[in-house]
Amino acid sequence: QGGTRSPRCDCAGDFHKKIGLFCCRGCPAGHYLKAPCTEPCGNSTCL
């Protein structure tokens, strides 16, 4: 029983991935994820 499962993140640019409920922009090299984004194609909180 499906749902509209998407094999990729439907976001502009190549730096988004599914983190939690949403597709989020990942953290840059040398930083770690503090909190995922809270909207589609949003920015994660990175430290």
Partner: antibody
Framework: EVQLVESGGDFVKPGGSLKLSCAAS????????MSWVRQTPDKRLEWVAA????????YYPDTVKGRFTISRDNAKNTLYLHMSSLKSEDTAMYYC????????????WGQGTTLTVSS | DIVMTQSPSSLAMSLGQRVTMNCKSS????????????LAWYQQKPGQSPKLLVY???SRESGVPDRFIGSGSGTDFTLTISSVQAEDLADYFC?????????FGSGTKLEIK
């Protein structure tokens, strides 16, 4: 057929605690984000907690943050909501809902379980 | 938080009439990345749980009759029932599925004359 069956609703005094359960069947439970949504006596719908699939992240509105905890047991296909420091305004019908994997709208809902908080 | 405002709060229609209900959000639900509006409509019949009708503002859920039509973009959305049937007696709620906290409108109660 997707089925979500809530249980655990009860009559609780203010300040008390309660744990609700939602048994899921008919789909691969661990592939989907899940939420709890409540409906107050005046019929308003209020989202109260969500949990993602995979590496689990949890989400809460400010109204319940620090008092409610959502969790899941993928081996048991069960979603939970642990509620503490309950207030009269938490009185509601509590539904579990499945998130569509792409849009995050609620594509399936359970039948609900009732929580009454009163002295 | 995104505030969702529905109107009217109730309406009474005769069978076969066209019904329109509105939902307004306090900020845009249009995602510039994918041009999708993150707005859903749910129907709740008396004594039942809510049921998904429409998502992404205009995508009808599988199995939902085609008399239910969602439209709108940005902050203003409409659910239309092209020819109301007796079984459409229900409360209708809009919800933004754009960001947490997910929020709902207060509902439109549809009564049949």
């Amino acid at each position: 057929e997707v089925q979500l069956v809530e249980s655990g609703g009860d009559f609780v005094k203010p300040g008390g605690s309660l744990k609700l359960s939602c048994a899921a069947s008919g789909f691969t439970f661990n592939n989907y984000g899940m939420s709890w949504v409540r409906q107050t006596p005046d019929k308003r719908l209020e989202w109260v907690a969500a949990i993602s699939s995979g590496v689990t992240y949890t989400y809460y509105p400010d109204t319940v943050k620090g008092r409610f905890t959502i969790s899941r047991d993928n081996a048991k296909n069960t979603l939970y909501l642990h509620m503490s420091s309950l207030k009269s305004e938490d009185t509601a019908m509590y539904y579990c809902g499945r998130h569509d994997d792409y849009g995050n709208h609620f594509d399936y809902w359970g039948q609900g379980t009732t929580l009454t908080v009163s002295s | 938080d995104i505030v969702m405002t529905q109107s009217p709060s109730s309406l009474a229609m005769s069978l076969g009439q066209r019904v329109t209900m509105n939902c307004k959000s306090s900020q845009s639900l249009l995602n510039s990345h994918n041009q999708k509006n993150y707005l859903a409509w749910y129907q709740q019949k008396p004594g039942q749980s809510p049921k998904l009708l429409v998502y992404f503002a205009s995508s009808r859920e599988s199995g939902v009759p085609d008399r239910f039509i969602g439209s709108g973009s940005g902050t203003d959305f409409t659910l239309t029932i092209s020819s109301v049937q007796a079984e459409d007696l229900a409360d209708y709620f809009c919800q933004q599925h754009y960001s947490t906290p997910f929020t709902f409108g207060s509902g439109t109660k549809l009564e049949i004359k």
